[in-house]
Amino acid sequence: AGVFELQIHSFGPGPGPGAPRSPCSARLPCRLFFRVCLKPGLSEEAAESPCALGAALSARGPVYTEQPGAPAPDLPLPDGLLQVPFRDAWPGTFSFIIETWREELGDQIGGPAWSLLARVAGRRRLAAGGPWARDIQRAGAWELRFSYRARCEPPAVGTACTRLCRPRSAPSRCGPGLRPCAPLEDECEAPLVCRAGCSPEHGFCEQPGECRCLEGWTGPLCTVPVSTSSCLSPRGPSSATTGCLVPGPGPCDGNPCANGGSCSETPRSFECTCPRGFYGLRCEVSGVTCADGPCFNGGLCVGGADPDSAYICHCPPGFQGSNCEKRVDRCSLQPCRNGGLCLDLGHALRCRCRAGFAGPRCEHDLDDCAGRACANGGTCVEGGGAHRCSCALGFGGRDCRERADPCAARPCAHGGRCYAHFSGLVCACAPGYMGARCEFPVHPDGASALPAAPPGLRPGDPQRYL
């Protein structure tokens, strides 16, 4: 168990032309808040997938009113860290989404209105217990600077927060097979639940379910004494009493390399191979510049000569993202019809058709319902030699394989604008309307049916989240 911590340093206009308009005005003061969503692994997940590692919302920042004529500065930020507790092991690799939200503080009935200003996403490697890692991300004309780290909550320690510590029972030393917990030298590693039958006297474990033997013992459950003749110890002194030792501590034990660096032993000490964006003896230094090669997949890095100035990645065709880390998914255009599987081979697209369909894009229907089912709980309806699926709620397409666009049914009333959001859909209501779907006029004009939007207002023009 532990906590992922995010510190927002600044949010403001990015470098270069086209500075964004200030999100606040004298007529409509506002304040910012942030939301972070974490997912394990480096998989390219859809924004809609759940925040499996956790999510957190910041406090509201100070109220900000734009000074007319002044350039848009960095906006005032909320105090404190965003903290995302994680219950299990820290995965080491993770994906993040950080959203910047604006809270309008006009005098509208029903309290403040919210709108999404910017969203950045990325994928990173990070070891728990390491130093703060710094990052810069862009969303349109906005730039977000932030730092993050993962730390273990006692009694957990280690780069994945899987080892446990507890106070010493005896003042001088830890129990058999239990090491002191660096950096808490007054604590010892707590015994884990080892493999069933593992000798309590001669065995111990570093991971649940394993059984590692103390010096002089061997076997799957550490119940067999080691004979002196079979001992070849690569390091550590031999012992006349027990015959031989298990290897003594090596320079890479406990992995001294931070931020996902990998450790290799050298004759004198150790050497860390650091991931992109980190350097130093233990990969502890993080200041992403072009020298660190932050652009993946052959992206061209521009600017960023020192750690405090930003860099920009110019991505080659087929890649996108602030670090060119995302492959442009040509299959997202769904070129394969009738539920065909799309394969992006790099040089070409190929469709693998479902049974009963053929053609380069699976456009030819060879059969009707016979031997074929509709996906995702849909039911097949026959007719005229062709088949049609009646799809369950939330799915569409010929075989119910496509996730229905939540905004396709125009779910926002009275000219509200619909946004597909990773927690569902969000309606931005026109002024004078409230409710999750903008279905409630704040001041209805009598009891008759109301127009779709007040006179002179283009539907969905003002973005208002209520």
Epitope: A413, G435, A436, R437, E439, F440, P444, A449, L450
Partner: nanobody, 117 residues
Framework: EVQLVESGGGLVQPGGSLTLSCAAS????????MAWYRQAPGKKRELVAG???????TYMESVKGRFTISRDNAKNSVYLQMNSLRAEDTAVYYC???????????WGQGTLVTVSS
């Protein structure tokens, strides 16, 4: 057409409680977004509380923490539980329904709530 019938209004002392009910003729209340509005003498009709078809609730700032909107799909009804009533809550309270199939609003006839000692 959806027909709405309000009940539960009356005279109550400041600090007292009252529950308004709104019964809908339509048997698919769960697909309606419903709300309570009020209109005090000489003032505009204003939204008090709403409950969307997906169950999310919206409240006017001045009633937050005092009023609670709820629905009972089985009874085809929506309710407004009003606690800690004040003199300024005196108004005619109207039930409102928004039908997504037709995208039309429907209104009840209103029920009078008077808060006075």
């Amino acid at each position: 057409e959806v027909q709405l019938v309000e009940s539960g209004g009356g005279l109550v002392q400041p600090g007292g409680s009252l529950t308004l009910s709104c019964a809908a003729s339509d048997s698919v209340v769960k697909f309606l977004s419903m709300a309570w509005y009020r209109q005090a003498p000489g003032k505009k009709r204003e939204l008090v509380a709403g409950i969307s078809a997906n169950g999310s609730r919206t409240y006017m700032e001045s009633v937050k923490g005092r009023f609670t909107i709820s629905r009972d799909n089985a009874k085809n009804s929506v309710y407004l539980q009003m606690n800690s009533l004040r003199a300024e809550d005196t108004a005619v309270y109207y039930c409102y329904a928004y039908r997504w199939a037709t995208r039309l609003p429907y209104w009840g006839q209103g029920t009078l709530v008077t808060v006075s000692s």
